[in-house]
Interface confidence: medium
């Protein structure tokens, strides 16, 4: 399988809320044995290989938003500690992998990554991510809401094997 | 919080059957791996097998093959293995583990207490 | 099965000073999707295993920094920079690459 980043771009005003969307592409095998672990981090532009840093998501790790379910099974963060910084990751059946960040500041722009691993028997055995940059604005200049902008078709299937 | 609570220590004679119970609090009990893990007094750590309480998947080291049997209850949240011809070489801490995955990397991250199973005549 | 063959089986160490633990295996433990899953549990005295090293050398989620994990195909290194008195116990490798999975005989890590 493969992530795709629907959108690169996140443009939104302060105090808005964002959902960033990854997009699981290709099969996906819903055997019993056969697990997805999927979580959010920051990470930095410039790097030789992207989304090979990690920064925390307001203080919260990519531990601490993962997630990890079946492969027919959809899954959310229920855990107080993510809603109480104002996040929720979620997954659905369809393949769509998402982070909510309620009442944006600028302190929330940044460059965001979203990784997906499958395992099997103990073994993770594909591990694909994909990136996508936030933009927090204030002022005369600031959208009055979140603006996306797609990714080309190159990016759109902006994947890493690690 | 994750917890494994296990069974109270077995006295056995030889022959007999043991089965030792593993209860699972804090995650979602039929998503992951049970692995059972046992350390002879004075010992180092052997693998005798794993079960994925939701689909009932087993997977047994071979020098067991044939005397064990894991099973699990998703309605209680309880593994049991079970070792039956038992020897006095079968004296031992039994462990169960339960599988926790860190970065996408599975591994056996919550040990229940032990089970001391003792098999004399 | 794969046999894990630790040294010493005894380490006697005086803090504050480095300690080295070798693992060896009857086979190469590479897996077929080409990750090596050797893994590093330290027993505490009364305690069960907890995990210190994963995949030879990535270490885990609050393991201090002076232990780290080395090696490839057969030959395994666990190294504490300075030991602690709080690093006492026994020491185990461990290969999840290859059904049965197994353990090193253990290594005991004890203060002078």
């Known amino acids: 399988f493969k992530v795709a980043t629907p959108y690169s771009l996140y443009v939104c005003p302060e105090g808005q809320n964002v959902t960033l969307t990854c997009r699981l592409l290709g099969p996906v095998d819903k055997g019993h044995d056969v697990t997805f672990y999927k979580t959010w981090y920051r990470s930095s532009r410039g790097e030789v290989q992207t989304c090979s840093e990690r920064r925390p998501i307001r203080n919260l790790t990519f531990q601490d938003l993962h997630l990890h379910h079946g492969g027919h099974q959809a899954a959310n963060t229920s855990h107080d500690l993510a809603q109480r910084h104002g996040l929720e990751s979620a997954s659905d059946h369809h393949g769509n992998f998402s982070i909510t960040m309620r009442n944006l500041t600028l302190l929330d722009s940044g460059l965001y990554c979203c990784l997906v691993v499958e395992i099997r028997h103990h073994h993770s055995e594909h591990r694909v991510h994909g990136a996508m940059e936030l933009q927090v604005q204030t002022g005369k200049d600031a959208p009055s809401n979140c603006v996306v902008y797609p990714s080309s078709s190159q990016d759109s299937e902006n994947i890493t094997a690690a | 919080q994750v917890q494994l609570v296990q069974s109270g220590a077995e006295v056995k004679k030889p022959g007999a059957s043991v089965k030792v119970s593993c209860k699972a609090s804090g995650y979602t009990f039929s998503r992951y791996w049970i692995e059972w893990v046992r350390q002879a007094p004075g010992q180092g750590l052997e693998w005798i097998g794993e079960i994925l309480p939701g689909s009932g998947s087993t997977n047994y080291n071979e020098k067991f093959k044939g005397r064990v049997t894991m099973t699990a209850d998703t309605s209680t949240s309880t593994a049991y293995m079970e070792l039956r011809s038992l020897r006095s070489d079968d004296t031992a801490v039994y462990y169960c583990?339960?599988?926790?995955?860190?970065?996408?990397?599975?591994?056996?991250?919550?040990w229940g207490q032990g089970t001391l199973v003792t098999v004399s005549s | 099965d794969i046999v894990m063959t630790q040294s010493p089986l005894s380490l006697p160490v005086t803090p504050g000073e480095p300690a080295s633990i070798s693992c060896r295996s009857s086979?190469?433990?590479?897996?077929?999707?080409?990750?090596?899953?050797l893994e590093w549990y330290l027993q505490k005295p009364g305690q069960s295993p907890q995990l210190l090293i994963y995949?030879?050398?990535n270490r885990f989620s609050g393991v201090p920094d002076r232990f780290s994990g080395s090696g490839s195909g057969t030959d395994f290194t666990l190294k504490i920079s300075r030991v602690e008195a709080e690093d006492v116990g026994v020491y185990y490798c461990f290969q999840g690459s290859h059904v049965p999975w197994t353990f090193g005989q253990g290594t005991k890590l004890e203060i002078k």
């Open positions: 086979q190469s433990i590479v897996h077929s999707n080409g990750n090596t899953y």
């Open positions: 995949k030879v050398s």
């Open positions: 583990a339960g599988e926790e995955v860190y970065d996408g990397y599975p591994w056996f991250g919550y």
